[in-house]
Interface confidence: low
Amino acid sequence: SLGSLAAAEPAVIAECKTRTEVFQISRNLIDRTNANFLVWPPCVEVQRCSGCCNNRNVQCRASQVQMRPVQVRKIEIVRKKPVFKKATVTLEDHLACKCETVVTPRPVT
Amino acid sequence: SLGSLAAAEPAVIAECKTRTEVFQISRNLIDRTNANFLVWPPCVEVQRCSGCCNNRNVQCRASQVQMRPVQVRKIEIVRKKPVFKKATVTLEDHLACKCETVVTPRPVT
């Protein structure tokens, strides 16, 4: 709306940078063959690039990434008892970001 | 996998709390009748609840929200020239979060 501008602060662009995001740990990251288990924790924090660039032809992308292995619990039910095991999930953290030109492929004629 | 756990730190749950997220300001928030304009900035930061709760029957939800009006630029093209106008967009910030029981409606029999 164009009205009620008095109390409104100027909007500030969300710059292209790393921010903390929540990554859901899906069970098939751990075991694709078996569904009879739970994962703990179900989600973790990761660093990801987000935000906007100066025009629509550029996008905020990671310029440097780091793989980070973490240990999660795989909770299986064996003979009606919970059995706590461990598994490794490799997370991707973004360390640096940049506004990168989006190259849209030309349609083949 | 059971191997290569040595270098893996235990995963820490992404707790239910407010985090900074990027909100894309879509043009139809400003003018649904006209597509011949740009918005600046195209995105802003907002505070939103995210993270996991202790079990699947509870979800991370906002327990307190605040509406925040911000001023954006509406850049119209009039006779091939940019015309700068102002508009207000109301953003929703989450101030506090809680793990809330998800009530799934019983199927009607």
Epitope: R73, V78, V83, F84, K85 | L2, G3, P10
Partner: antibody
Framework: EVQLVESGGGLVQPGGSLRLSCAAS????????MSWVRQAPGKGLEWVST????????SYADSVKGRFTISRDNSKNTLYLQMNSLRAEDTAVYSC?????????????WGQGTLVTVSS | DIQMTQSPSSLSASVGDRVTITCRAS??????LNWYQQKPGKAPKLLIY???SLQSGVPSRFSGSGSGTDFTLTISSLQPEDFATYYC?????????FGGGTKVEIK
């Protein structure tokens, strides 16, 4: 460097009680499951009890169930074993162990142990 | 409860010998089998976890194999510092159980 130091052992009469402590250092204690394992003189290893990182999950050997209680204080980096109704067959060296490996039920670092002697 | 049976209970060997110790579980434990070394008056030391994974810092002459119910610890070339007692342990389910131990002595 991971260090686990047990204390609290000693001579106790049958039916008596003791509380063992295990002071941990050199790792993030609150992130790891911990266990007690015992070894009677000249005998093999016997698992006693395990506690989860947050303390919410505990397991006990049948031989000590109902008599021993495992607990932890993450703010003090300390593991405990409260032993009640002690019997002669509980005589052993009690060691705490950290489970940082492939399952919560293996022991990759051990303390040197503290001797508990149950005798009249 | 899962019983772990180790054999032999003791063996005599010379430096440089290849030594094999076996461990049998009373039911399948997948690959949740660990091997420990204990020297007199010392705390046990983890050698192998998950049946075949070498613990960090353990010499490569130690290796483990097997899955299900039958497992083997092999020392490819026995060294003077390897004379000790070796224990297997299942980490599949509580109650956690150890084998009775195998004492490796100097011939």
């Amino acid at each position: 460097e991971v260090q686990l130091v047990e204390s609290g052992g000693g001579l106790v009469q049958p039916g008596g009680s003791l509380r063992l402590s295990c002071a941990a250092s050199g790792f993030t204690f609150s992130s790891y499951w911990m266990s007690w394992v015992r070894q009677a003189p000249g005998k093999g290893l016997e698992w006693v009890s395990t506690i989860s990182d947050g303390g919410g999950t505990t397991s006990y050997a049948d031989s000590v169930k109902g008599r021993f209680t495992i607990s932890r204080d993450n703010s003090k980096n300390t593991l405990y074993l409260q032993m009640n109704s002690l019997r002669a067959e509980d005589t052993a060296v009690y060691s705490c162990a950290e489970s940082g490996g492939a399952t919560d039920y293996l022991f990759d670092y051990w303390g040197q142990g503290t001797l508990v002697t149950v005798s009249s | 409860d899962i019983q772990m049976t180790q054999s032999p209970s003791s063996l005599s060997a010379s430096v440089g010998d290849r030594v094999t110790i076996t461990c049998r579980a009373s039911q399948s434990i997948s690959s949740y089998l660990n091997w420990y070394q204990q020297k007199p008056g010392k705390a046990p030391k983890l050698l192998i976890y998950a049946a075949s994974s070498l613990q960090s810092g353990v010499p490569s002459r130690f290796s483990g194999s097997g899955s299900g119910t039958d497992f083997t610890l092999t020392i490819s070339s026995l060294q003077p510092e390897d004379f000790a007692t070796y224990y297997c342990q299942q980490s599949y389910i509580t109650p956690l159980t150890f084998g009775g131990g195998t004492k490796v002595e100097i011939k």
